[in-house]
Each structure stands twice: as structure tokens, then as C-alpha cells.
């Protein structure tokens, strides 16, 4: 297994609709034909998958049909968007990204991108 | 379930253009790479021509660069193989098989006769 | 004359094992995945091994691929009649920017 370097940003702020989106870029070595994108959460010291993602050379990145991440590849970056979050789902997601074909494999995990998700007020009641 | 289903097949003389569609259902058309193989009368499969899922890449064999163009309409789930300039060998049943370089489906194919 | 090359026939009885070959180069099998083919009389070509030894949910385990420098291989063990039919590798050819078939061969079981 070598490793590889993973890019993605720091911080980002989740929208009022509890959507996040952001773009997690790798180091290619060599023209990999088949990548594999995982997007792990970490918190409170534990770590869980959220999502994960293989795509072919000339195919468009496909989560599973109940995923709550939906992407796009484009050359060596993937954009990233999870939907569905609330403000307990603040925390840390890592983008690993593993090269999958052809050998030699390659491994590469970022450092995370903490996300912040604030739930929005509930409207006061209006009367008229 | 998966079905690729292609159409446009016929007679035509030499030197002149038909227009092959293959229809997919079962899966989401526009998250795929999609490409043509055909297979002469007796002979073995010779690849055509592959689209990438949003049409921003498309690769030709030799054998037919500049005279057949590939596209899709993702909004009809509907890929097109338009064949112009025609001769004799590219007599051939054509198929339409999913992704670039594994194809895990492929239609039943469309018989096309070029011939005088 | 394909780019990749495979012998025009094989042959073997029930319950044995044959061997398939398939020579390409360093532009094909030798740097991109290689995928098999099985094409019965009469119908289109199914998938049967991809990324040069894995096997597509459906497909026994009778099946099996391999891949060594530019060459790969097909195994097939526990040979049946109803394996007769036409085998063909297939690799993406990174000089030709397109993908290149074997010119197949003709499995006879006996």
C-alpha cells in the first residue's frame, strides 16, 4: 500500500437546509482507471463511514440510491455534498480516497473538514 | 433490470448513412459511460466507440474515425451511433454495451448490411 | 490482426480444466485492466471476468483470471457442455485511446 496526499478544506458551514459541499482533492500518482471515495465522520474519538463511492474511468461518481452524500468527479477532485444533517452531526468528515486499478494501490486519507451544522430557529407564530 | 435495446439496423447501400439508437432502462443512463461494439458476420468483436456519461470525452477505433460520431441524450436515456460514409466491412451486428472498459451489459444488437 | 492475441481454438473433455491465453503490450494488458467475455451461439457477449481476475455476481467459481506482465489468461475447471462457446479478452489500449479486443476463441467440449 502507498500512500498518497488528500486535500480538503478546513472548515465549512453546513446551509439552513442541513446540506454541506465540499471538494476533496488527490494526488494522483498515475492515471488510476477505478477509484474508490470514502467519507468517514469522526467524533468523540469515534470514527464512522457516512458514505462510500467506487467510479470507472468515464463514469460519473454513484453513491447508493439511500445515501445522504451525492458527488462529481472531475479529473483528480471528487465535490462532495451531504444532505440530511443537523446540528448533532457536527464534526470532523475525512475524505480517504484509494486508488483501486491499476496496481500498485494507493491509499490517501485528508485531514478532515470539520463541519458545522446549526439547526435553524423554528418560525415564531404569527398572527394576522 | 438492466436492458440496452438497439434499433436502427438495415440495409443500406454504400457510401451512404444510417442512424443507430440504443434505448437503456434498469439504471441511471447518465452516471454511465456508454459504447458501441459491432462483430462482422463470423468474425469476432471489434470495438466502435465510447461516450462518457456527460459526453465530455468520446474515443473512436481508427477504422471508423471521421465518419461515425457518437452522442447521447441523457434526457431520453438514449444512446446514438450516426454512421456516415459506409462501406462493405462495416457490415456488422452493432451492439451498445455499458461503460468504457468493462462492459457488464450489452444489448442483443442491430444487424447493419452494406451492400449494392 | 487484433491488437491482442488469443489461440482460434481449445478443446477439452467434461470435467477437465483448459487454459485460455490472451498476449498483449505495455499499452494494453500491461498497464489497464483486462476483461473477459463468454459468447454463446446465437447471443451477445456476457461478462465474465473483470479487472483481470474478478467475477461478476452470477458467474461460478468454475471461472477464473489471471494476469502476468502483458498476458492474462482464462481458466475454466470443471469443464461443461454448455461452456462451448466463443471467449474473448479485452483490454483498454492506452496509445490507441480506445479499447482492444482478442480475435476470440472457440471453446469445443468433447
Known amino acids: 500500500c502507498k500512500a498518497m496526499h488528500v486535500a480538503q478544506p478546513a472548515v465549512v458551514l453546513a446551509s439552513s437546509r442541513g446540506i454541506a459541499s465540499f471538494v476533496c482533492e488527490y494526488a494522483s500518482p498515475g492515471k488510476a482507471t477505478e477509484v474508490r471515495v470514502t467519507v468517514l465522520r469522526q467524533a468523540d474519538s469515534q470514527v464512522t463511514e457516512v458514505c462510500a463511492a467506487t467510479y470507472m474511468m468515464g463514469n460519473e461518481l454513484t453513491f447508493l440510491d439511500d445515501s445522504i452524500c451525492t458527488g462529481t468527479s472531475s479529473g483528480n477532485q471528487v465535490n462532495l455534498t451531504i444532505q440530511g444533517l443537523r446540528a448533532m452531526d457536527t464534526g470532523l468528515y475525512i475524505c480517504k480516497v484509494e486508488l483501486m486499478y491499476p496496481p500498485p494501490y494507493y491509499l490517501g486519507i485528508g485531514n478532515g473538514t470539520q463541519i458545522y451544522v446549526i439547526d435553524p430557529e423554528p418560525c415564531p407564530d404569527s398572527d394576522f | 433490470e438492466v436492458q440496452l435495446l438497439e434499433s436502427g439496423g438495415g440495409l443500406v447501400q454504400p457510401g451512404g448513412s444510417l442512424r443507430l439508437s440504443c434505448a437503456a432502462s434498469?439504471?441511471?443512463?447518465?452516471?454511465?459511460?456508454m459504447s458501441w461494439v459491432r462483430q462482422a458476420p463470423g468474425k469476432g468483436l471489434e470495438w466502435v466507440s465510447v461516450i462518457y456519461y456527460d459526453g465530455s470525452n468520446k474515443y473512436y477505433a481508427d477504422s471508423v474515425k471521421g465518419r461515425f460520431t457518437i452522442s447521447r441524450d441523457n434526457s431520453k436515456n438514449t444512446l446514438y451511433l450516426q454512421m456516415n460514409s459506409l462501406r462493405a466491412e462495416d457490415t456488422a451486428v452493432y451492439y451498445c454495451?455499458?461503460?468504457?472498459?468493462?462492459?457488464?451489459?450489452w444489448g442483443q444488437g442491430t444487424l447493419v448490411t452494406v451492400s449494392s | 490482426q487484433s491488437v491482442l492475441t488469443q489461440p482460434p481454438s481449445a478443446s477439452g473433455t467434461p470435467g477437465q480444466r483448459v487454459t485460455i491465453s490472451c498476449s498483449g503490450s505495455?499499452?494494453?494488458?500491461?498497464?489497464?485492466?483486462v476483461t473477459w467475455y463468454q459468447q454463446l451461439p446465437g447471443t451477445a457477449p456476457k461478462l465474465l471476468i473483470y479487472?483481470?481476475?474478478n467475477r461478476p455476481s452470477g458467474v461460478p467459481d468454475r471461472f477464473s483470471g489471471s494476469k502476468s506482465g502483458t498476458s492474462a489468461s482464462l481458466a475454466i475447471s470443471g469443464l461443461r457442455s454448455e461452456d462451448e462457446a466463443d471467449y474473448y479478452c479485452?483490454?483498454?489500449?492506452?496509445?490507441?485511446?480506445?479499447?482492444?479486443f482478442g480475435g476470440g476463441t472457440k471453446l469445443t467440449v468433447l
Open positions: 434498469g439504471f441511471t443512463f447518465s452516471n454511465y459511460a
Open positions: 454495451a455499458r461503460n468504457t472498459y468493462r462492459f457488464d451489459y
Open positions: 505495455s499499452s494494453n494488458i500491461g498497464n489497464n485492466a
Open positions: 479487472s483481470d481476475s
Open positions: 479485452g483490454s483498454w489500449d492506452s496509445s490507441l485511446s480506445g479499447y482492444v
